[in-house]
Each structure stands twice: as structure tokens, then as C-alpha cells.
Interface confidence: medium
């Protein structure tokens, strides 16, 4: 795994965002701002966006900035998984995707980033101050989690700015290593901002690679420093969490199966039974660090299109094998 501070690839500003600031003067502060936000060796970014067309619909995008292969991604809301959070979707690179209401569509965007669209209707509608968390696991090296939310005052169609994750394990070496550069960069950024404070500045929309301060490496050098830097999870308003969601998939929840013909609703002996959308075909470079998954063809292929999964009322043994996540 890399230990240097990572700056995500920046995309060019979207049309209409340059405003009075020229392209060059816009990009440099943005790079520096990104550097400031990515201090502490970030690994996971989270972006929450409210759709302009459907005010109760949210899109959550999450990405992993490390170099290992992703074994599992869990998206939850209401806080981190295991700390009061409720699972919305579980994405597996080979076995596919499982999702629970109000998640409408979870999908892989790249081999290390995902997106999730949330339906917003009735009791299970998310609201602006809901916290969404993404946990990326790379077995057996570790897992990294970051959370984000949409500020209540955000305009529809705008993304949440990167905010520090409530779970934080900072890599001290990463912080110290870039602190000098950051100090200079942040001072210069302030200087630029002061220069432009009398000019009409456009409203910036963070690119989809906006980083989120992470739960940095679980194997950071010093456990003591991890403990010292651990930020307790803040209390959040959970009034928007659905009353019905936990009953939809109670602990030890049911098996999950796809709307396949009866003969197909059966777990094959191989581990490719999440009958849902697999990750797009991987290139040969993905035979990465933890060695769990190599190239796409090396596990049994999926036998169907992306399918909506729903709970099986017959209980945990409706299908062979342990399929229930929650």
C-alpha cells in the first residue's frame, strides 16, 4: 500500500464554472485546497449529492485511493457500519451487488469507486443531514471507512464539500511528511483568495474525486497514535432513518436471491452466486496486492443481468450457502 499523501486526479472544471476567474487561477487554488483536505494520507473519499430534479433523491459516490484490490464495499447511513449505521448496499467485485431500500441503484463506477442512488419517498426518505458512510475492505490487509453528508443548506444539484470523516485514524508520517508543503500551499491559497475576494467567484462543485479524510490505514505505524487521534463518532439526527429498514433485513437476515427462474435460484458451488451486476471487466494489472482476486475471468461468470434482489421470506436456508448480510 502507498504511504505517501495521495492527491486524486483532478478533473477540469465543469462548463460555466470558471466565471470571472481564469482557468489557471482556478486550478491552482483547487489543487492546493485538495492538498489541504487530503492531509493525513487519505484512502477513501465520499461525495453526497442531492439531485436537482428529485429533491428527495440522493447520489452517494465513494472511492478508494489506495493501491490494493477491493474485496468488499459496504455503504451505510446513519453512521458507520456497526456504530448505529444501517446497511444500504454491499458490493463485491465478483459476486455482484446487494442493496436494500431505499437504495435504488448501486453500481461500480471503476474498480475502486462506486455510486449509489437513493430513492426518496415516504418513511424511508433520506434527509439533508443524514450521514452516509462507505467502507472499503481489502482482505486481509485491512479496511478503510469514511463518511459524508449533505449540509442542510446545500442547494439542489450541488455536491457536499469534502468534510473530515468522523472516524479518523491518521498516519502521522503522512501528515508530517507533507506538512511543510501544505503550510506553504495553504498560505498561498489564502493569498489567492484574498486577491479574488472582491471579484465575483463562481459556486464551485467538487469533482467526483473529491477526497474525504479517511479512516486511514488500519496498520498505521503506531497504535498509540491511532488511539490518540481517534475521533469519537458524533451524535447525529437519525429522524430521517426509516422505521421499517431494520425489519426489512433483521440481524441474521434472510438469504437474498434474484428474480431468476426457479432452477436458477440456487447458489452454485463456486462463489459467484450474488446474481447481480459484476464489476466491469478488469485489466491484467488487477492481480494486486492481497491476491484474493486476479483477473475477471478467474471466477465463475455471472449467469444473468443486473437483477434487483429482494428478501426471501423462506428464511436463511432458502438458498444454499450463507448469503445474508444483514
Amino acid at each position: 500500500m502507498r504511504t505517501e499523501a495521495q492527491v486524486p486526479a483532478l478533473q477540469p472544471p465543469e462548463p460555466g464554472l470558471e466565471g470571472a476567474m481564469g482557468h489557471r487561477t482556478l486550478v491552482l487554488p483547487w489543487v492546493l485546497l485538495t492538498l489541504c483536505v487530503t492531509a493525513g494520507t487519505p484512502e477513501v473519499w465520499v461525495q453526497v449529492r442531492m439531485e436537482a430534479t428529485e429533491l428527495s433523491s440522493f447520489t452517494i459516490r465513494c472511492g478508494f485511493l489506495g493501491s490494493g484490490s477491493i474485496s468488499l464495499v459496504t455503504v451505510s447511513w446513519g453512521g458507520p457500519n456497526g456504530a448505529g449505521g444501517t446497511t444500504l448496499a454491499v458490493l463485491h467485485p465478483e459476486r455482484g451487488i446487494r442493496q436494500w431500500a431505499p437504495a435504488r441503484q448501486a453500481r461500480w463506477e471503476t474498480q475502486s469507486s462506486i455510486s449509489l442512488i437513493l430513492e426518496g419517498s415516504g418513511a424511508s426518505s433520506p434527509c439533508a443531514n443524514t450521514t452516509f458512510c462507505c467502507k472499503f475492505a481489502s482482505f486481509p490487509e485491512g479496511s478503510w471507512e469514511a463518511c459524508g453528508s449533505l449540509p442542510p443548506s446545500s442547494d439542489p444539484g450541488l455536491s457536499a464539500p469534502p468534510t473530515p470523516a468522523p472516524i479518523l485514524r491518521a498516519d502521522l508520517a503522512g501528515i508530517l511528511g507533507v506538512s511543510g508543503v501544505l503550510l506553504f500551499g495553504c498560505v498561498y491559497l489564502l493569498h489567492l483568495l484574498r486577491r479574488h475576494k472582491h471579484r465575483p467567484a463562481p459556486r464551485l462543485q467538487p469533482s467526483r474525486t473529491s477526497p474525504q479524510a479517511p479512516r486511514a490505514r488500519a496498520w498505521a505505524p503506531s497504535q498509540a497514535s491511532q488511539a490518540a487521534l481517534h475521533v469519537p463518532y458524533a451524535t447525529i439526527n437519525t429522524s430521517c432513518r426509516p422505521a421499517t429498514l431494520d425489519t426489512a433485513h433483521p440481524h441474521g437476515g434472510p438469504s437474498w436471491w434474484a428474480s431468476l427462474p426457479t432452477h436458477a435460484a440456487h447458489r452454485p458451488q463456486g462463489p459467484a452466486a450474488w446474481a447481480s451486476t459484476p464489476i466491469p471487466a478488469r485489466g491484467s494489472f488487477v492481480s494486486v496486492e492481497n491476491g484474493l482476486y486476479a483477473q475477471a475471468g478467474e471466477r465463475p461468470p455471472h449467469t444473468g443481468p443486473g437483477l434487483t434482489l429482494f428478501p426471501d421470506p423462506r428464511g436463511p436456508r432458502a438458498m444454499e450457502g450463507p448469503l445474508g448480510v444483514r
Epitope: 456497526g82 475492505a137 491476491g291
Partner: antibody
Framework: EVMLVESGGGLVKPGGSLKLSCAAS????????MSWVRQTPEKRLECVAT????????YYPDSVKGRFSISRDNAKNTLYLQMSSLRSEDTALYYC?????????????WGQGTSVTVSS | QIVLTQSPAIMSASPGEKVTMTCSAN?????IYWYQQKPGSSPRLLIY???NLASGVPVRFSGSGSGTSYYLTISRMEAEDAATYYC?????????FGSGTKLEIK
């Protein structure tokens, strides 16, 4: 039915070597990550080696690094643990276990164990 | 590496009684699992990712917790629940186990 059957344990002198085997059946062995976990006479559990499913990368805690080597033969559906420079503290019941990613990589199936005693 | 401490080391409960045992970590962990081991048998997975029951596990078992403190609860103790219970973490390699809680029937 998933089955894991360990063999190869026995009595060995300090500094000696031993190779444990775990025969797997009832599942697609090559796709799964596997571990060797030992249980000491005091009933403490310790994971001593893990191997990835497809790429076969290996992981060891410091207590056995350089002395133990995990490997697999996917054609034979068999997991191995080569132990060398054995010490008295390696005396334990050795289990092989499967990591199930539906269960977030918990060890969902374990063998019955094979006993290793290191004594002079 | 992460150290897991289980408490109490030994406890006893009457049939029908509620039982709770604790697993404490010296650092925040990502995933916690609970296993049950009966004398002469291999460990059996009970709970994964803090609170999810593995297949075939009775619903009287439940898991909870976050950060550094995790709990295994048996809502109504039964004779067959007498066993040793181990927690295990996966935040990074190596996976580590707690020292176990031995649950006896009164």
C-alpha cells in the same frame, strides 16, 4: 457438504520440522482465502498463516514469520503449512479454516484440527 | 497488533437467564466476529461484522458494539449454550482473537 480435514501433526523435537495438510471438499477451494489457526493448551487461538484465494499471497504474524510457510495446491484442493525451527511454544492444535466473504471474511468452516507437540 | 480482552473469563447462568459478555480492543477495529467452541469441537462462527447472525445460529444470540467495545448477548440461556465464546477482529493482519469467555450452566 463443506469439509476440511487436517493431517500431519505429531511429536517433534525443538528445532525440528513438520508439514501439515488440510484436504478440502464440498466447495470451490481455489476461490477462497484460507488460514491456519492454532489453539494452545491454554485454549488461546492464534492465526498463524493466511493465503489468498486466487493470487495466493501469504501473510504471517511476527511470531512465526520466517519459520512457517503456507501454500496451496488448488488442483488437489489441499492447503499446507510447512513448519520449521519449531519451538515448545508452537505446541498446539492446528486448525485450517476457510474465509467466507459473504461473512465479511469470517472463518465459517473449520477442520477438526491436528495436534502438534514440540518437546524434547 | 490489536489485542482483544474478553470479560468475564468465566461466567455461569441459569436456563432462561440473559447473558452478556464483552470484548474490548486496545484500538478501534473494523470487523468483529464471535465464535462458539464446545469441548472437543472446533470453533463455530456465530456472528460476523459485529451484529449479523451466521446461518443456522439461533436468534437468541445477538451482537452489538462499535469502536473498541463489543458485546455478545444470549437473550435466554439454554443448556446447549454452555461453551467458550471467542471474539476475533479483522482490521488488519494478523487477525487476533480474544482469550475467551467460558459460559457454564448453573
Amino acid at each position: 457438504e463443506v469439509m476440511l480435514v487436517e493431517s500431519g501433526g505429531g511429536l517433534v523435537k525443538p528445532g525440528g520440522s513438520l508439514k501439515l495438510s488440510c484436504a478440502a471438499s464440498g466447495f470451490s477451494f481455489s476461490s477462497y482465502s484460507m488460514s491456519w489457526v492454532r489453539q494452545t493448551p491454554e485454549k488461546r487461538l492464534e492465526c498463524v498463516a493466511t493465503i489468498g484465494g486466487v493470487g495466493g499471497n501469504t501473510y504471517y504474524p511476527d511470531s512465526v514469520k520466517g519459520r512457517f510457510s503456507i501454500s496451496r495446491d488448488n488442483a488437489k484442493n489441499t492447503l499446507y503449512l510447512q513448519m520449521s525451527s519449531l519451538r515448545s511454544e508452537d505446541t498446539a492444535l492446528y486448525y485450517c479454516a476457510r474465509h467466507e466473504d459473504y461473512y465479511y471474511y469470517a472463518m465459517d468452516y473449520w477442520g477438526q484440527g491436528t495436534s502438534v507437540t514440540v518437546s524434547s | 497488533q490489536i489485542v482483544l480482552t474478553q470479560s468475564p473469563a468465566i461466567m455461569s447462568a441459569s436456563p432462561g437467564e440473559k447473558v452478556t459478555m464483552t470484548c474490548s480492543a486496545n484500538s478501534t477495529v473494523s470487523y468483529i466476529y464471535w465464535y462458539q467452541q464446545k469441548p472437543g469441537s472446533s470453533p463455530r462462527l456465530l456472528i460476523y461484522d459485529t451484529s449479523n447472525l451466521a446461518s443456522g445460529v439461533p436468534v437468541r444470540f445477538s451482537g452489538s458494539g462499535s469502536g473498541t467495545s463489543y458485546y455478545l448477548t444470549i437473550s435466554r440461556m439454554e443448556a446447549e449454550d454452555a461453551a467458550t465464546y471467542y471474539c476475533q477482529q479483522w482490521s488488519s493482519f494478523p487477525f487476533t482473537f480474544g482469550s475467551g469467555t467460558k459460559l457454564e450452566i448453573k
